[in-house]
């Protein structure tokens, strides 16, 4: 079953068949005897009841108000009323572009990554029984495809696939020919798949410390939204009351990735904290990356080359 028209604001193109379906449809079937009314308001005309006599272009069926076709003067507010249920839509009918096979304002944009699966299927479930044939156009040039009932493109996207694809359904109603156009603006972009998360800075860090003092070890990474960053140390994390994993700070980058940092705070440094590995790991579906910190007493730092020190 075609789902109801839940969007309160709708824009359509003049000259095409169009329908509004209210959202208490299954309820309406149950109470056949209940009075169901459709109204229109526009300009000075408030709440004018609609019926097939209002216009030869309007048809009413159960849950649906149909336009054969919709025209510019159909712009306005529409109401469905049944008992204490009311649904309202604001309809804006725009001019058809006479110089193109589609109207720019009625285009759905889609971004497809190069080499990823790309599909366009021309379907219209509401009008399907009335559709005689359907054609698919790319940039207003007809594509020769085998199936003229539901033309379909299924392929791995290439940059040449970019363009405007218009599905045009041709249908008959009461001896007249109508068409319905649905256009997609397909943009092919470079692969935007997840980055391999990376920990910033050297993989091994010796940190010069003094016993009894505190130290903060900062671990930063560039990662995807679902990637995680965590510290591992000692036998079992949390066994040392002097070691605290601080809250993660995460900020989104302009590219839609995340910059995350997590600090390990070690208070009142003791002998047991020296010369052991404090590992920071970033994990993603694609694998893990780890960097290590080793606390070294300041007095011992002469044994270690200068370039491995961090503050």
């Amino acid at each position: 079953a075609e789902s109801c028209t839940s969007r309160p604001h709708i824009t359509v193109v003049e000259g095409e068949p169009f329908y509004l379906k209210h959202c208490s449809c299954s309820l309406a079937h149950e109470i056949e005897t209940t009075t169901k009314s459709w109204y229109k308001s526009s300009g000075s005309q408030e709440h004018v009841e609609l019926n097939p006599r209002s216009s030869s272009r309007i048809a009413l069926h159960d849950c649906v108000l149909e336009f054969w076709p919709v025209e510019l003067n159909d712009t306005g507010s529409y109401f469905f009323q049944m008992k204490n249920y009311t649904q309202k839509w604001k309809l804006n009918v725009i001019r058809r572009n006479k110089h193109s096979c589609f109207t720019e304002r009625q285009v759905t944009s889609k971004i497809v990554e190069v080499k990823k699966f790309f599909q366009i299927t021309c379907e219209n479930s509401y009008y399907q029984t009335l559709v005689n044939s359907t054609s698919l156009y790319k940039n207003c040039k007809k594509l020769l495809l085998e199936n003229n009932k539901n033309p379909t493109i299924k392929k791995n996207a290439e940059f040449e696939d970019q363009g405007y694809y218009s599905c045009v359904h041709f249908l008959h109603h009461n001896g007249k020919l109508f068409n319905i156009t649905k256009t997609f603006n397909i943009t092919i972009v470079e692969d935007r798949s997840n980055i391999v998360p990376v920990l910033l800075g050297p993989k091994l860090n010796h940190v010069a410390v003094e016993l009894g003092k505190n130290v903060r070890l900062n671990c930063s990474a560039l990662l995807n939204e679902e990637d995680v960053i965590y510290w591992m140390f000692g036998e079992e994390n949390g066994s040392d009351p002097n070691i605290h994993e601080e809250k993660e700070m995460r900020i989104m980058t302009p590219e839609g990735k995340w910059h995350a940092s997590k600090v390990l705070r070690i208070e009142n440094i003791g002998e047991s904290n020296l010369n052991v590995l404090y590992n920071c790991t970033v994990a993603s579906t694609g694998g893990t990356d780890t960097k290590s910190f080793i606390l070294v007493r300041k007095a011992d730092m002469a044994d270690i080359p200068g370039h491995v020190f961090t503050r």
Epitope: I111, R192, N237, K247, E248, G256
Partner: antibody
Amino acid sequence: EVQLQQSGAELVKPGASVKLSCTTSGFNIKDIYIYWVKQRPEQGLEWVGRIDPANGDTKYGPNFQDKATITADTSSNTAYLQLRSLTSEDTAVYYCARRGNYGAGFGYWGQGTLVTVSA
Amino acid sequence: DIQMTQSPASLSASVGETVTITCRASGNIHNYLAWYQQRQGKSPQILVYNAKTLADGVSSRFSGSGSGTQYSLNINSLQPEDFGTYFCQHFWSTPYTFGGGTKLEIK
């Protein structure tokens, strides 16, 4: 201001399908994942799945692999949840959500869409 | 998949009291945990993210703690507006499952 606006309540028959929408504002939908959560009447919360609108990549919870399809239209900043072969078990409020800007937690939620499956 | 076990399932308390709700994860989730409050007929609202960080605009009467697999939400000096249902949720790896919820009622 970040907002997630969901479509209205749906009353559908068993075996039918329904498509719910979640229109976002205050941010670019391509920059952040959109998640869907199910809550049956007087029950807990269940993670349905998520979409990365930038590339259409989706993940689903174990109970929703064959039940749900999540899509997104970046031109209208809208995410969709389609549910098929509906049964009374699918009667629930469905929420869309996104993370806050700073980490682990859904900082922003839609107002929810009630789907009622009834003959 | 990580499972979250939340306790108690329901709790009665009086205004002014302090209550604690706990969540146990089936594996180490390294503080990737959020707490939410949900009032009747409303969407959940985040209280705490990253296990311990209070979300913007949340009263300091709420606090999150824990590490590894064990986490708690503490509510000090209960106020009438605190009554509702509380959920925890892990963010360690998808699916991001929720705890079963704790219904906090006025005694």
